[in-house]
Structures are given as C-alpha cells and as structure tokens.
Interface confidence: low
Amino acid sequence: MMTGTIETTGNISAEKGGSIILQCHLSSTTAQVTQVNWEQQDQLLAICNADLGWHISPSFKDRVAPGPGLGLTLQSLTVNDTGEYFCIYHTYPDGTYTGRIFLEVLESSVAEHGARFQIP
C-alpha cells in the first residue's frame, strides 16, 4: 500500500535571468528511494540515482544544477521555462510517487521568490 505523500514548493514565480530551486520531499513512508527523475512536461531534465548519483540531460547541462538534496536548481531562467515540472520518486517497495510544481517566469522585478528550501 502506498502511504507516502509528496510535498513540493507548489506554484512559484521567479524573474527572467534569475534562478530557482525546485524542491520535493517524500514523507510518511519508509520506502527506499531508488531514483528521482525531474521532468518538464515530456522532457527529462535530470536523474538522481541512489547508486549512480546525478545525470543531467545534455541539453540542460548549462542551466540545470543538482540539488540541494534531491531538488533541482534552474539557472538563467527564460520566459520559455514557464510551465509544469514534475519530481518522480521511484521507491521500493511502494512504487512511483509524483509531485507537481508550476513555475512562472516573469519579465518584471515583481516576482516572488517562493522557493526557499524548507526543512521537513
């Protein structure tokens, strides 16, 4: 039975040219996390494998940095980065948990930087 829940940074906004941390946290389960995938719509951004470490998709290598933790940092944001991001936790024995974050990249300086890392 899947008892876990994923907490995310939710809907966040950031300024064009800035950076943002995408953060998910899996709680309420003792399942072992074997891999976390970060995806934007249908594109794979990065993988963090428990045994192999991080792999960043080559097309995003210049603008994506691993962490903190199992999170993902997006840099040099453009308006085209606006959209849905998914953290997909592969766990044993529970299976797959998915969290959703919506990022809006704004032209102006009124963006709220709401992606502070929260300690569970």
Epitope: V33, G53, W54
Partner: nanobody
C-alpha cells in the same frame, strides 16, 4: 550510530574568515551527500551549501563566491570555508547528511560576525 559533530565556530570581525568542520561517523561517508545549513536568531533554518559524491558543489546565492564546501573522505569530514564574512552571516551552522532527505543533523556551531 550516526553522528555528526560540528566545530570551528566563534566570534570573527566583518571581513574575516572561519573554517567549519563536520566530523562524521557511523555511516559510509564516501558515498554520502553532505550539506550545511544555518539558522539565525528568530529565522528559519536555511540551506547554505551542499557537496555530492562525484564532486558536485553548489551554494545559496547569499554565500556564493565567499563560502567553499568540501569533503575529505579519508577523514570522514566535511568543511565549510567562510571568507569575507558579514554580520548577516551570524547564525548557528549545522551540517547534515543527505539521504532521501536530510536525515541526520549535527548539534550546530555558533558563528558570530561582529566588530
């Protein structure tokens, strides 16, 4: 039993430097991911820097270019070299082991930046 013990904190003048150490035991340090956090009086604990196996390091914007995180696997110790310290860096600094999340914490070491 997992243990993380921080040291190296103290009182330093603005512009000064400190090197924090985090001695780890009870787990395989060489395949662990370590992070430093800090908590200023009356504020939430915030992430400062992390180092992953494979040499990935990254930093909060507020410390980038001033702080350097590193790890010495032979000594099972993580370090945070802090240069050009500012009064706003005053906080209790904690090291943490990253697993599926930050699952083990040290007791913290106080850094005070004041003239």
């Amino acid at each position: 039993e997992v243990q993380l013990v921080e040291s190296g904190g103290g009182l330093v003048q603005p512009g000064g430097s400190l090197r924090l150490s985090c001695a780890a035991s009870g787990f395989d340090f060489s395949v662990s991911w370590m992070g430093w956090f800090r908590q200023a009086p009356g504020k939430e604990r915030e992430w400062v820097a992390s180092v992953l196996r494979g040499g990935y390091t990254w930093y909060a914007d507020s410390v980038k270019g001033r702080f350097t995180i590193s790890a010495d696997n032979s000594k099972n110790t993580a370090y945070l070299q802090m240069n050009s310290l500012k009064p706003e860096d005053t906080a209790v600094y904690y090291c943490a082991r990253e697993g599926s999340w930050f699952d083990y914490w040290g007791q913290g070491t106080l850094v005070t930046v004041s003239s």
